[in-house]
């Protein structure tokens, strides 16, 4: 595939990665979906610089993001350790709340109104936030 | 009401070590980051370090990185900042401050200690 | 680092007058920034946090405004107690810097 090296119409720049900021709200796996049709998965957090930029776009809204346990620990849907990594969860969380009598506990995790995370039950159709790398191979067929 | 009260200032050689304490109150200490802000003499404000309010991130400025180390006991409603390798620019008084997680700005400052490193 | 350059240095005013301090940084920090206020012998005050919202507690006579790069800290009408030195803060990125400070003065 060719390089990547300017973001799509309708999405943001930063730091040489490409945001999407949805208006609607979809459970977790369909956000995750939309996001992989889109070439790119749901906004993996990084660093405080990168929380700060999303917090400021997503605003004070639940918001879906690409970290989950649904297969026992906590994973980055792009592969970035989480156990090394950046995190920001509210206190007390992640729960894996059962009390909420959906089902199960609490999967996927969410930006919440101040911008910390938080664990919830990943069919709430929440907003969600698709991010892609400026500097990674596209998977569209070179043009002849 | 929030109350944050630093101790553990004084005068201290080059080189040498020292322990600073805030003791907080009046809110769910666990709950908040919290900062470390110095205060030089005659100059102005500036940022030390930060520690989440699960101890889970911690940063530094760069001139004390290294050096100094933030650390919380959330059992003990008390952050710490252990100052090693002093130097004489260290010389200020240090505050503490409350995180607000919508800015990371200091909601509310203790009244702050002294720290002297001098010869 | 994010440079802030904080102007003026120290003003002098007179009691009723609108006063304000300007604040740019060296790179867009979208509206993570705050303004300080500090006197002597008393622990720093937030008055304004991401760019425009007024803590809570502080006199509606000070605002903010701002984004990106350029940031303003206005008092509306200068008090008596305002007599201090303000320090714009940018939080955005770290190590999280502030501006030199302002002074601010009554004639």
């Known amino acids: 595939g060719s390089e990547r090296t300017c973001c799509p119409v309708n999405w943001v720049e930063h730091e040489r990665s490409c945001y999407w900021f949805s208006r609607s709200g979809k459970a977790w796996a369909d956000a995750d979906n939309y996001c992989r049709l889109e070439d790119a998965h749901l906004v993996v957090v990084t660093s405080w610089e990168e929380q700060k930029f999303v917090q400021h776009h997503i605003g004070p809204v639940n918001t879906w993001m690409g970290l989950h346990d649904q297969n026992g620990p906590w994973k980055w849907v792009d592969g970035t350790d989480y156990e090394t990594g950046f995190k920001n969860w509210r206190p007390e969380q992640p729960d894996d709340w059962y009390g909420h009598g959906l089902g199960g506990g609490e999967d996927c995790a969410h930006f919440t109104d101040d911008g910390r995370w938080n664990d919830d039950v990943c069919q709430r159709p929440y907003r969600w936030v698709c991010e892609t790398e400026l500097d990674k191979a596209s998977q569209e067929p070179p043009l002849l | 009401q929030v109350q944050l009260v630093e101790s553990g200032g004084g005068v201290v050689q080059p080189g040498r070590s020292l322990r600073l304490s805030c003791a907080a109150s009046g809110f769910t200490f666990s709950s908040y980051g919290m900062h470390w802000v110095r205060q030089t003499p005659g100059k102005g404000l500036d940022w030390v370090a930060v520690i989440w309010h699960d101890g889970s991130n911690k940063y530094y400025a760069d001139s004390v990185k290294g050096r100094f180390t933030i650390s919380r006991d959330n059992s003990k409603n008390t952050l710490y900042l252990q100052m090693n390798s002093l130097r004489a620019e260290d010389t200020a008084v240090y505050y503490c401050?409350?995180?607000?997680?919508?800015?990371?700005?200091?909601?509310?400052w203790g009244q702050g200690t002294l720290v002297t490193v001098s010869s | 680092d994010i440079q802030m350059t904080q102007s003026p240095s120290s003003l002098s005013a007179s009691l009723g007058d609108r006063v304000t301090i300007t604040c740019r940084t060296s790179q867009s920090i979208f509206n993570y920034l705050n303004w300080f206020q500090r006197k002597p012998g008393k622990a720093p005050k937030v008055l304004i946090y991401t760019a425009s919202s007024l803590q809570s507690g502080i006199p509606s006579r000070f605002s903010g405004s701002g984004s990106g790069t350029d940031f303003t800290l206005t008092i509306s009408s200068l008090q008596p107690e305002d007599s201090a030195t303000y320090y714009c803060?940018?939080?955005?990125?770290?190590?999280?810097?502030f501006g030199g400070g302002t002074k601010v003065e009554i004639k």
């Open positions: 803060q940018q939080s955005y990125s770290i190590p999280l810097t």
């Open positions: 401050a409350r995180d607000d997680p919508r800015s990371s700005a200091g909601d509310y």
